[in-house]
Amino acid sequence: VPRWRQQWSGPGTTKRFPETVLARCVKYTEIHPEMRHVDCQSVWDAFKGAFISKHPCNITEEDYQPLMKLGTQTVPCNKILLWSRIKDLAHQFTQVQRDMFTLEDTLLGYLADDLTWCGEFNTSKINYQSCPDWRKDCSNNPVSVFWKTVSRRFAEAACDVVHVMLNGSRSKIFDKNSTFGSVEVHNLQPEKVQTLEAWVIHGGREDSRDLCQDPTIKELESIISKRNIQFSCKNIYRPDKFLQCVKNPEDSSCTSEI
């Protein structure tokens, strides 16, 4: 008789999840000399230990602590780029602007980017059929808790001027329920962070509005100001130029060297 398996509302674990995590770890440590000391098998064991045999609605930040310890990494605290609802452009940007870092440019963020995973209570199996959905099932699921944990740590590490890239095409340019709005904003350290500068990326060239005046941006400004951090916002009116420059950094009209 086949054993009953919990059906969750979200997609199951990404296929070849263990192999993917291990391969990404090896690739990352080869590319980043400062992380060459990392033992990728130990990283995978710690990752696995965070969710295997545990109820996928009962995961805690503590479960991920062994992984956090192994993945400890120092990035320049004044070169951090946060993002919300505009991941691809933020990643294209840091691939070119190599002295800036998103969470996904760190080892732990790189390992888990775009992946889904969960296990089952009391079995060592990975659930490839379904995993809990944050809204429909539970928020303390393996994926959500992982991103909450690494995002909190990433924000806590930031200093000086922190940048955040926001999507000006969305109805909520700043969304309190996003990882940025619910975790990162509240974990920037006022004693270290002087300013949060938002870059609002406009959707089209014809859009000449001041999206920094958007009510949700004002809400973000209020939250940040109450935390004794200065807030600054810039309209980025040329998404075409921005994209062109992040894709072709060697393009002569993209350089700020005069």
């Epitope: 870059w199 001041d210 600054s232 916002c233 810039k234 980025i236 062109q244 700020s256």
Partner: antibody, heavy 123, light 105 residues
Framework: QVQLVESGGGLVQPGGSLRLSCAAS????????MNWVRQAPGKGLEWVSH??????????EYAASVKGRFTISRDNSKNTLYLQMNSLRAEDTAVYYC??????????????WGQGTLVTVSS | DIELTQPPSVSVAPGQTARISCSGD??????VSWYQQKPGQAPVLVIY???NRPSGIPERFSGSNSGNTATLTISGTQAEDEADYYC????????FGGGTKLTVL
């Protein structure tokens, strides 16, 4: 080094036409967006027109004051920027500068300018 | 479009600090560039992206931008700094301020 040299200015009657040229050298002309900026005698700078480069399909933009009357174009094989000015008015009298648009991911600015050519519209 | 307003003139004694303002509704939300223009000459870029100096521009030139005012600061002003100064921004179209005549007394 970067050089921009404007020509084609002169005296023209109201309603008349004129074509300005800007010869570029010292850089890969086709790789840059180009602009025309003007300055009326004793007055400030006013942006006139813009033409993007090849990978943005040579899109053009114009200030409201010249839209429908002026046409910007470029000939990359000749490293030359043009401004065709029709239906000229007295208020178009100005020194016209050709300017190269430089920039970063975030913003654009005019890093290099020509010396300008004077257009006088008068009867 | 955003309107940029500059004082028509600013005077400063040699060696002193000159500050030229460029005001506009929430100008801090836009990147600002500054140009220097001497009589009979073409403008020269002195500051871009609020506070960046092109190579060849003396360190005494600096820029800031927040709230409703962008400021060009010239520390230890020299006689050769006497010129017209223009601020410029972009919000889908290029906009220049009216210009400020800097006089070095």
């Amino acid at each position: 080094q970067v050089q921009l040299v404007e020509s084609g200015g002169g005296l023209v009657q109201p309603g008349g036409s004129l074509r300005l040229s800007c010869a570029a050298s010292g850089f890969t002309f086709s790789s840059y967006a180009m602009n025309w900026v003007r300055q009326a005698p004793g007055k400030g700078l006013e942006w006139v027109s813009h033409i993007r480069k090849k990978n943005t399909s040579y899109t053009t933009e114009y200030a409201a004051s010249v839209k429908g009357r002026f046409t910007i174009s470029r000939d990359n094989s000749k490293n030359t920027l043009y401004l065709q000015m029709n239906s000229l008015r007295a208020e178009d009298t100005a020194v016209y500068y050709c300017a190269r648009e430089d920039g970063s991911y975030m913003t654009d600015y005019f890093a290099y300018w020509g010396q300008g050519t004077l257009v006088t519209v008068s009867s | 479009d955003i309107e940029l307003t500059q004082p028509p003139s600013v005077s400063v004694a040699p060696g002193q600090t000159a500050r030229i303002s460029c005001s506009g509704d929430n100008i801090g939300h836009y990147y600002v560039s500054w140009y220097q223009q001497k009589p009979g000459q073409a403008p020269v870029l002195v500051i871009y992206s609020d506070s960046n100096r092109p190579s060849g521009i003396p360190e005494r030139f600096s820029g800031s931008n927040s709230g409703n005012t962008a400021t060009l600061t010239i520390s230890g002003t020299q006689a050769e700094d006497e010129a017209d100064y223009y601020c410029q921004s972009y919000n889908g179209t290029y906009v220049f301020g009216g210009g400020t005549k800097l006089t070095v007394l």
